[in-house]
């Protein structure tokens, strides 16, 4: 299911105290995501069948137009705000992909499982980024954009948009893991 995507609470009220070594945990989660991103991408395009596996550049290239930007040379605060936006975008996109794949590829259980596991880590990452932004930087609100709504697309477009998103995810998660 899609991530809960409420923006950072304006009052910055955190219900639970943040974990110790919060930045280490964020780094660990990014490393975990980076370590599994390529396997998820391969699992996805393989499950879609032809023409996807033989047309990756054309159908799965990471050309996602409205993807939130990231600047690796920014301050920690700026990078965390951008990371927050990216995780929200990826979370909603992953939710859409998971929903679509349950309909399009109901028997691809290993794909469903990997999508769900990735979404779980993203949820934890979102929570930790939020904690860090609130506790250290008192950032009470971040404007976010959500992933594209694929619900009204045809079969091919659903598959293609999912493949492009996961191609972008694989690319950006490597950058993020390096930047923190």
């Amino acid at each position: 299911s899609p991530l809960p995507i409420t923006p950072v609470n304006a009052t910055c009220a955190i219900r639970h105290p943040c974990h110790n070594n919060l930045m280490n945990q964020i780094r660990s989660q990014l490393a975990q995501l980076n370590g599994s991103a390529n396997a998820l991408f391969i699992l996805y395009y393989t499950a879609q069948g032809e023409p996807f596996p033989n047309n990756l550049d054309k159908l799965c290239g990471p050309n996602v137009t409205d993807f939130p930007p990231f600047h690796a040379n920014g301050t920690e605060k700026a990078k965390l705000v951008e990371l927050y936006r990216i995780v929200v975008y990826l979370g909603t996109s992953l939710g859409n992909i998971t929903r679509d794949q349950k309909i399009l590829n109901p028997s691809a259980l290993s794909l469903h499982s990997k999508l769900n596991a990735t979404a779980d880590i993203l949820r934890g990452l979102l929570s930790n980024v939020l904690c860090r932004l609130c506790s250290k930087y008192h950032v009470g609100h971040v404007d976010v954009t959500y992933g594209p709504d694929t619900s009204g697309k045809d079969v091919f477009q659903k598959k293609k948009l999912g493949c492009q998103l996961l191609g972008k995810y694989k690319q950006i998660i490597a950058v993020l893991a390096q930047a923190f």
Epitope: S151, D154, V155, F156, K158
Partner: antibody
Framework: QVQLQESGPGLVKPSDTLSLTCTVS?????????WSWIRQPPGKGLEWIGY?????????YYNPSLKSRVTISVDTSKNQFSLKLSSVTAADTAVYYC????????????WGQGTLVTVSS | DIQMTQSPSSLSASVGDRVTITCRAS??????LAWYQQKPGKVPKLLIY???TLQSGVPSRFSGSGSGTDFTLTISSLQPEDVATYYC????????????FGGGTKVEIK
């Protein structure tokens, strides 16, 4: 029982705009349905015109050969969707069907009875 | 731009015959193919979807097979009430596609 019913004028003059409405009853417009128009010229095969998705994205797809002349819109409060085809000619004379397709929209499982529209002066 | 080609365009067979209609897509459509039956003056009726799944209420003498680009509709034992035109329809990609339907196959009794 779900029913789709087309309505609109049976005779349209050349160069005018053809307007048809499809009323869906026994079924609340679902956000996971596509509502389509399909036509069939006399003695010929089926031709897909386009669809509208009744969800937040409001996606529409149109047959490229008709795209410049076609508009499909929806009125969810009335459970209706409509077709407008501009600058009609005799070649647009056909039985027009409205149809519905369930997610992932790969086949049409709901059909109206069809209405014959003749383009003639 | 996916083109759907049906063959033959018409056929005549005897009651009890096995009848086969083929549909070819110009590029892969995976298994997203449907078959419809249209009797004269009537609304098209969905027979088979996802290449081989029989729609509820359709007689078991109708079957579908195929994947990728080549598909077949088979009537195992032709009955008088099967006289109709049969259409295939791809449901894989509607973008930039002039017609998702095949040209039709008219089935008559000898």
């Amino acid at each position: 029982q779900v029913q789709l019913q087309e309505s609109g004028p049976g005779l349209v003059k050349p160069s005018d705009t053809l307007s048809l409405t499809c009323t869906v009853s026994g079924f609340s417009f679902s956000t996971d349905y596509w509502w389509s128009w399909i036509r069939q010229p006399p003695g010929k095969g089926l031709e897909w015109i386009g669809y509208i998705y009744v969800g937040t994205s409001g996606d529409t797809y149109y047959n490229p050969s008709l795209k410049s002349r076609v508009t499909i819109s929806v009125d969810t409060s009335k459970n209706q969707f409509s077709l407008k085809l501009s600058s009609v000619t005799a070649a647009d004379t056909a039985v027009y069907y409205c149809a519905g397709a369930d997610n992932p929209y790969d086949y049409f499982n709901l059909w109206g009875q069809g209405t014959l529209v003749t383009v003639s002066s | 731009d996916i083109q759907m080609t049906q063959s033959p365009s018409s056929l005549s067979a005897s009651v009890g015959d096995r009848v086969t209609i083929t549909c070819r897509a110009s590029e892969t459509i995976s298994g997203y193919l449907a078959w419809y039956q249209q009797k004269p003056g009537k609304v098209p009726k969905l027979l088979i979807y996802r290449a081989s799944t029989l729609q509820s209420g359709v007689p078991s003498r109708f079957s579908g097979s195929g994947s990728g680009t080549d598909f077949t509709l088979t009537i195992s034992s032709l009955q008088p009430e099967d006289v109709a035109t049969y259409y295939c329809q791809q449901g894989y990609s509607y973008s930039d596609t002039d017609n998702v339907f095949g040209g039709g196959t008219k089935v008559e009794i000898k």
